[in-house]
Amino acid sequence: ALDAAYCFRNVQDNCCLRPLYIDFKRDLGWKWIHEPKGYNANFCAGACPYLWSSDTQHSRVLSLYNTINPEASASPCCVSQDLEPLTILYYIGKTPKIEQLSNMIVKSCKCS
Amino acid sequence: ALDAAYCFRNVQDNCCLRPLYIDFKRDLGWKWIHEPKGYNANFCAGACPYLWSSDTQHSRVLSLYNTINPEASASPCCVSQDLEPLTILYYIGKTPKIEQLSNMIVKSCKCS
């Protein structure tokens, strides 16, 4: 799997999970989240060469098509596969509220 | 939706469905499929600017992150959303066999 265990240990130009820390205030302009101040969002990036972690029949076909037609622009792309939620604390006036924001953290990637 | 109805009617540089006909023999080197000779596989391509058809909370966050941090390389990517199967006819010796290949045709796209 193209997850932290694999990607953060290996120098990988191909599609892989990349570390990205997002500071809510500085990077998003969000002042409304009290805790955490930021989080490890991560992101997916890198080349998708022939059959590198292709996730669907279509992406495998596209991968093969690109190998045979190297001038083609139709190539798979490195995107998130598994995502996890992030629990945040924010205030509605003086009242604290805990909320789980879905699909905020990328855990693994794929070529799609 | 970034589907044929929208994308094939509009000239769109941003993430959209693109037409792609794949000839099994010529483009994939597959001689084993008897019918059809090829099919409209389509593919997804184009830029994913600020919140253009972002499909998850993470891709929306990443989109906002890129707006505030334009030097960042962490940007969403244009990939397939809805896929459909393709029915093919092939032969096992002299015996015809009909098979449904899943996720072969891209029907719509998203920024992920």
Partner: antibody, heavy 120, light 108 residues
Framework: DVQLVESGGDLVKPGGSLRLTCVAS????????MHWVRQAPGKGLQWVAY????????YYADSVKGRFTISIDNSKNTLYLQMNSLKTEDTATYYC?????????????WGQGTLVTVSS | EIVMTQSPASLSLSQEEKVTITCRAS???????LAWYQQKPGQAPKLLIY???SRAPGVPSRFSGSGSGTDFSFTISSLEPEDVAVYYC?????????FGQGTKLEIK
């Protein structure tokens, strides 16, 4: 320069529907919580609803809950207020406003307002 | 919900006079969950004071705010002709956000 421009106000019969639009410019729209506030003719200000961009967390005043829906198109820098089952007491000038940063906060920028009249 | 009671409902003062408007909350807001707005006829409200005492950018120094808990006040140190408007207090300590009923300020 920060600008908020509302539109969509009209004369509508009781029980009818209307959608208000607020287009924002001059700042990173998705960074600030957005509110709708209304003002009946010759009366004071009444808060209606808020939405947190990107995460789409919304909250409503009891008087409009179940009838009004606040929504946002982050890519178009646009805030909406879908108003259904309108009552005569919904007659007011509707303002969109941006908070300083917190969910409940002072509102540092307001639109010019759009007038909704509910009458038979 | 928190009820905000503003007084007086209206006042008429001479130019250069000091203006004081008070706002009382039905329950404690703490020290910083109060804002003051100015609304001129046919215009949207304009933020003057937030956090009970902080002036919004571009607001003249003659406008000030103070108070905490349930009692807050808004002051114009020297009334100018352009200050003719309705002034509102707003609490944001609790949901729903509520406003005072407004104070109409006129010049004699």
């Amino acid at each position: 320069d920060v600008q908020l421009v509302e539109s969509g106000g009209d004369l509508v019969k009781p029980g009818g529907s209307l959608r208000l639009t607020c287009v924002a410019s001059g700042y990173t729209f998705s960074s600030n919580v957005m509110h709708w506030v209304r003002q009946a003719p010759g009366k004071g200000l009444q808060w209606v609803a808020y939405v947190i961009p990107i995460v789409d967390i919304a909250y409503y005043a009891d008087s409009v809950k179940g009838r009004f829906t606040i929504s946002i198109d982050n890519s178009k820098n646009t805030l909406y207020l879908q108003m259904n089952s309108l009552k005569t007491e919904d007659t007011a000038t509707y303002y969109c406003a941006r908070t300083l940063g917190l969910v409940l906060d002072a509102m540092d920028y307001w639109g010019q307002g759009t007038l909704v009249t509910v009458s038979s | 919900e928190i009820v905000m009671t503003q007084s007086p409902a209206s006042l008429s003062l001479s130019q250069e006079e000091k203006v004081t408007i008070t706002c009382r909350a039905s329950q404690s807001l703490g020290s910083s969950y109060l804002a003051w707005y100015q609304q001129k006829p046919g215009q949207a409200p304009k933020l003057l004071i937030y956090g009970a005492s902080s002036r919004a950018p571009g607001v003249p120094s003659r406008f000030s705010g103070s108070g905490s808990g349930t009692d807050f006040s808004f002051t114009i140190s020297s009334l100018e002709p352009e200050d003719v408007a309705v002034y509102y207090c707003q609490q944001y300590a609790d949901s729903p956000i509520t406003f005072g009923q407004g104070t109409k300020l006129e010049i004699k």
